[in-house]
């Protein structure tokens, strides 16, 4: 009796949902009542699907109403895992057991990245000096650096601070502030660069004709 | 080399008890499931009891439900039948058998153990 | 409960081919294994999942299935090859387990 696995690594983002498979020979037709299935990642019990049915009174919270059994998968021979709503804790080794007049169990990590895509900024002037603040902030993980360029390719220096996010314990919140002598309509970007997996998100901020007060503040979406 | 070798058979009174065992080597036993098939002299196969290999799903026929136990100790490689209430017809031929991976079918046989119930 | 019907004898001419029934309600629904069991010996596992054979099982033996009959196939029956064939199938897969009522086969010459 062998399980087999197509995947062995999944990398999700951050919210986002995920489907694990181990898959383990069927009949013809198959007997869910010498089928148990167990799904656990590290101490914590995600699946435990015995009797024809799951347990969910062993479920470990933190998975409560995101992870489920896909049981029409089951007929297919395929023991599929969905956790929707993705938290970077639900990285981590998790590992597939199944009986089925046999036993066998497999491991498969998933790895999770919170890219930083969804880029705030906000753009200010000190009306005695005339220098421009322009700020950019976003969340993701792992952390990123911010790099700053004029529209001519030159790279500016700015002030990055990296905090955690109040909307998750893992989350990093990297806020970056360039401090400039700038005139109307130039166009300046903010890259946050991040390594593993890399990727690279970039705002543009556009310096406007006439500042109100107080300063402008846009939400800019890649 | 697998192998499955069965013992505890004997001649019973009826209504007395026994227990099989089968001891088996040459293969992960933890990862099988086990059973015991029965042959009355002379006549077809008949499967007495089946163990899965993990949590201990188990399945008899009806003529020995009740009866009958089928057990594992995966620390031992054994599986055991243990048979009260024995009656004139279960004399057979008791086989053990490995199941063959997820399959109804058995892929390894015990060369059998003989239970005899007479008064 | 499911039942398997089989003939309970069938004769072959030495080097000709032997087919062995098994009858069951939509059997070519489920699996069907075949054993073969000589005379005082445990029965051997010759044919899974319809027509796969185990390593070390002899080419000249072949399994099929569908409808209500699956067929066992002994192309070029040998000497050796008398003994008694069980078809197997289930009710329900892996604790359903249901055997036919055997075959015995006599090659003959």
């Known amino acids: 009796f062998t399980i087999t696995v197509s995947k062995d690594l999944y990398v999700v983002e951050y919210g986002g949902n995920v489907t694990m498979e181990c898959k383990f020979p069927v009949e013809k037709q198959l007997n869910l009542f010498a089928l148990i299935v167990y799904w656990e990642m590290e101490d914590k019990k995600i699946i435990q699907f015995v009797n024809g049915k799951e347990d969910l009174k062993v479920q470990h919270s933190s998975y409560s109403q995101r992870a489920q059994l896909l049981k029409d998968q089951l007929f297919l021979g395929k023991a599929a895992l969905q956790i929707t709503d993705v938290r970077l804790q639900d990285a981590g080794v998790y590992c597939c057991l199944i009986g089925y007049g046999g036993a066998d169990y497999k491991r498969i990590t998933l790895k999770v990245h919170a890219p930083y895509r969804n880029i705030s900024q906000r753009i200010s002037v000190d009306p005695v000096t005339s220098e421009h603040e322009l700020m950019c902030q976003a969340e993701g993980y792992p952390e990123a650096e911010v790099i700053w360029t004029s529209s001519d390719h030159r790279v500016l220096s700015g002030k990055t601070t990296i905090t955690n996010s109040n909307r998750e314990e893992k989350l990093f919140n990297v806020t970056s502030t360039l401090n400039i002598n700038a005139t109307a309509n130039e166009i300046f970007y903010c890259t946050f660069q991040r390594s593993g997996p890399e990727e690279n998100n970039t705002a543009e901020l556009v310096i406007p004709e006439r500042l109100p007060v107080p300063a402008s503040e846009r939400t800019h979406f890649m | 080399e697998v192998q499955l070798v069965e013992s505890g058979g004997d001649l019973v009174k009826p209504a007395g008890s026994l227990r099989l065992s089968c001891v088996a080597s040459?293969?992960?036993?933890?990862?099988?499931?086990m059973s015991w098939v029965r042959q009355a002299p002379e006549k077809g196969l008949q499967l007495v009891a089946w163990?899965?290999?993990?949590?201990?799903?188990?399945s008899y026929a009806n003529a020995v439900k009740g009866r009958f136990t089928i057990s594992r100790d995966n620390a031992k490689n054994t599986v055991y039948l243990q048979m009260n209430s024995l009656r004139a017809e279960d004399t057979a031929m008791y086989y053990c058998?490995?199941?063959?991976?997820?399959?109804?079918?058995?892929?390894?046989w015990g060369q059998g153990t003989l239970v005899t119930v007479s008064s | 409960s499911y039942v398997l019907t089989q003939l309970p004898s069938v004769s072959v001419t030495l080097r000709q081919t032997a087919r062995i029934t098994c009858g069951g309600d939509s059997i070519g629904s489920k699996n069907v294994y075949w054993y073969q069991q000589k005379l005082g010996q445990a029965p051997v596992l010759i044919i899974y999942?319809?027509?796969s054979r185990p390593s070390g099982i002899p080419e000249r033996f072949s399994g099929a299935n569908s409808g209500n009959t699956a067929t066992l196939t002994i192309s070029g029956a040998l000497a050796e090859d008398e003994a008694d064939y069980y078809c197997q199938s289930y009710d329900i897969p892996l604790t359903g387990t249901v055997f036919g009522g055997g075959t015995q086969l006599t090659v003959l010459g």
């Open positions: 058998a490995r199941g063959q991976g997820g399959r109804s079918s058995f892929d390894y």
């Open positions: 040459g293969f992960t036993f933890s990862s099988y499931s």
């Open positions: 999942d319809d027509s």
């Open positions: 163990i899965d290999a993990y949590a201990g799903v188990t």
